[in-house]
């Protein structure tokens, strides 16, 4: 058993049929010695008396809010949550496996630049009685500070018969060094509590591996005289690290016909302009990627050829 | 050339060669979405590689103030990786494919380090740890980790030379 926060405790249980469970001793936080009784949740049934209560925790019916009283007055509470381990593996019932970029991916994180700011998100089908708490650091043995905000519900989607809820959190490394080569990964830890079930999820990454620039901005076309060619120009996104002479991007320019089956023409360039042939009903799209490190491409910025 | 005395390197040449190094490093060990190196083996085998750290002066301001600290650090790393790529880790079993980019990568690391330090000048270099695993799979794992680490190192070096070529070239 360990303390998650004040008066909230997590009992780790091997979860299999007829498992013996864990013996837990609760102590009433009071100077009083006599006349103390214990109850669980809203029930008035007295579970025991005395300053300590010993219980055998085997299932969710044994978890909940234990309260010690004296003469009708509440002295203290202890909330017991269960963390299940089945076949040596901690349960992952609360969050959905996003399966990208690989199986057992529950947390996904992205950064728009090298400033040390990043966003993580996760999915669940649970709509109520759900709380999350996020902690992060750089490195684990001698951790350096990363400050995370509160997790918030950022999107709701309907997936078949189910509703899916997306939660996200923003974090910022306290002493970020954008130009340095990272040697220790960022660690992100999410505590999830649904009713009386506790689970924790972790992710470990370098900022450089989760970089995804915003799309290029101010995408413009300038027709060239007496030609089907156009000059496409764009700018670095505002959110990208500066100076751009140091934090450089490379770009992919694509000409795509109306039909998805039509052949796509692609040009790669380090410049912020390119000359392409504009076909009727086609659109021109540009996306960006770090020039020197193959992290994710940005989403496309697009304009119609006409 | 970045001689220890403090003259400027051939920024544009260094920029071109460092960008080529980036391309080679990624073609030698391409990105695979579902691959997480921390899954490949628990033991941290590449802790001893030189990293370009915050105080090494490789940020834009540090380069403006005095690029020598940074260039020395880059040189140190290039020599270190060049030795690793020429070591038993890459020459032993399993054999490299005949058209492996590792040969070109090795030559380019040497080329860039020589651009930074001509013959006769010596910056101190870091000893490479004696890592020679006995099993072919351990050697392959080490190659993965070294190349992933090299990708991060050459990305910073390429940024330094691109910025130098754009802002510090005479």
């Amino acid at each position: 058993i360990w303390e998650l926060k004040k008066d909230v405790y997590v009992v780790e249980l091997d979860w299999y049929p007829d498992a013996p469970g864990e013996m837990v001793v609760l102590t009433c936080d009071t100077p009083e010695e006599d006349g103390i009784t214990w109850t669980l949740d809203q029930s008035s049934e007295v579970l025991g008396s005395g300053k300590t209560l010993t219980i055998q925790v085997k299932e969710f019916g044994d978890a909940g809010q234990y309260t010690c009283h004296k003469g009708g007055e509440v002295l203290s509470h202890s909330l017991l949550l269960l963390h299940k381990k089945e076949d040596g593996i901690w349960s992952t019932d609360i969050l959905k496996d996003q399966k990208e970029p690989k199986n057992k991916t529950f947390l996904r994180c992205e950064a728009k630049n090298y400033s040390g700011r990043f966003t993580c998100w996760w999915l669940t089908t649970i709509s109520t009685d759900l709380t999350f708490s996020v902690k992060s650091s750089r490195g684990s043995s001698d951790p350096q500070g990363v400050t995370c905000g509160a997790a918030t519900l950022s999107a709701e989607r309907v997936r078949g018969d189910n509703k899916e809820y997306e939660y996200s959190v923003e974090c910022q490394e306290d002493s970020a060094c954008p130009a340095a080569e990272e040697s220790l990964p960022i660690e992100v830890m999410v505590d999830a509590v649904h009713k009386l079930k506790y689970e924790n999820y972790t992710s470990s990454f370098f900022i450089r591996d989760i970089i995804k620039p915003d799309p290029p901005k101010n995408l413009q076309l300038k027709p060239l005289k007496n030609s089907r060619q156009v000059e496409v120009s764009w700018e670095y996104p505002d959110t990208w690290s500066t100076p751009h002479s140091y934090f450089s991007l490379t770009f992919c320019v694509q000409v795509q016909g109306k039909s998805k089956r039509e052949k796509k023409d692609r040009v790669f360039t380090d410049k912020t302009s390119a000359t392409v042939i504009c076909r009727k009903n086609a659109s021109i799209s540009v996306r960006a990627q770090d020039r020197y490190y193959s992290s994710s491409w940005s989403e496309w910025a697009s304009v119609p050829c006409s | 050339r970045a001689v220890p005395g403090g003259s400027s390197p051939a920024w544009t040449q260094c920029q071109q060669l460092s960008q080529k190094l980036c391309t080679l490093a990624w073609s030698a060990h391409p990105l695979v979405g579902h691959m997480d190196l921390r899954e490949e083996g628990d033991e941290e085998t590449t802790n001893d590689v030189p990293h370009i750290q915050c105080g090494d002066g490789c940020d834009p301001q540090g380069l403006r103030d005095n690029s020598q600290f940074c260039l020395q650090r880059i040189h140190q790393g290039l020599i270190f990786y060049e030795k690793l790529l020429g070591s038993d880790i890459f020459t032993g079993e399993p054999s490299l494919l005949p058209d492996s980019p590792v040969g070109q990568l090795h030559a380019s690391l040497l080329g860039l380090s020589q651009l930074l330090q001509p013959e006769g000048h010596h910056w101190e270099t870091q000893q490479i740890p004696s890592l020679s695993p006995s099993q072919p799979w351990q050697r392959l794992l080490l190659r993965f980790k070294i190349l992933r680490s090299l990708q991060a190192f050459v990305a910073v070096a390429a940024r330094v030379f691109a910025h130098g070529a754009a802002t510090l070239s005479p």
Partner: nanobody, 126 residues
Framework: EVQLVESGGGLVQAGGSLRLSCVAS????????MGWFRQAPGKEREFVAA?????????HYGDSVKGRFTISADNGKNTVYLQMNSLKPEDTAVYYC??????????????????RGQGTQVTVSS
């Protein structure tokens, strides 16, 4: 789900040659490592050869086939080949094609895999 289909097995005289092929169904081919294992009746599974495109690209052979067998690949066709020369009766076995997409070859070199085919029988008569 990667599916692997082997072909090219058969009966051959000692000293003869065979070429096995294995076609992979998925486009993840070049990000995986591919290899061959074999199993003779009543014997342990044995590593034969592997080829991969990560870590600089690599080829590796089991000790018993070194110098006689050659593994190669055609990425465009998602196909891996095993050219077997100077065949001996002890090469008789079912030959399985295998893919390691998660660890890019490390699993193959350790003697395991993510996926394998149904196998093709190779019989070498004396």
């Amino acid at each position: 789900e990667v599916q692997l289909v082997e072909s090219g097995g058969g009966l051959v005289q000692a000293g003869g040659s065979l070429r096995l092929s294995c076609v992979a169904s998925e486009r993840t081919f070049s990000s995986s490592a591919m290899g061959w294992f074999r199993q003779a009746p009543g014997k342990e599974r044995e590593f034969v050869a592997a080829i991969g495109w990560s870590g600089g690209g690599f080829i590796h052979y089991g000790d018993s086939v070194k110098g006689r067998f050659t593994i190669s690949a055609d990425n465009g066709k998602n196909t891996v080949y095993l050219q077997m020369n100077s065949l001996k009766p002890e090469d008789t076995a079912v030959y399985y094609c295998a893919a390691d997409s998660r660890l890019r070859g490390i699993a193959l070199l350790k003697g395991s895999y993510d996926y394998r085919g149904q196998g093709t029988q190779v019989t070498v008569s004396s």
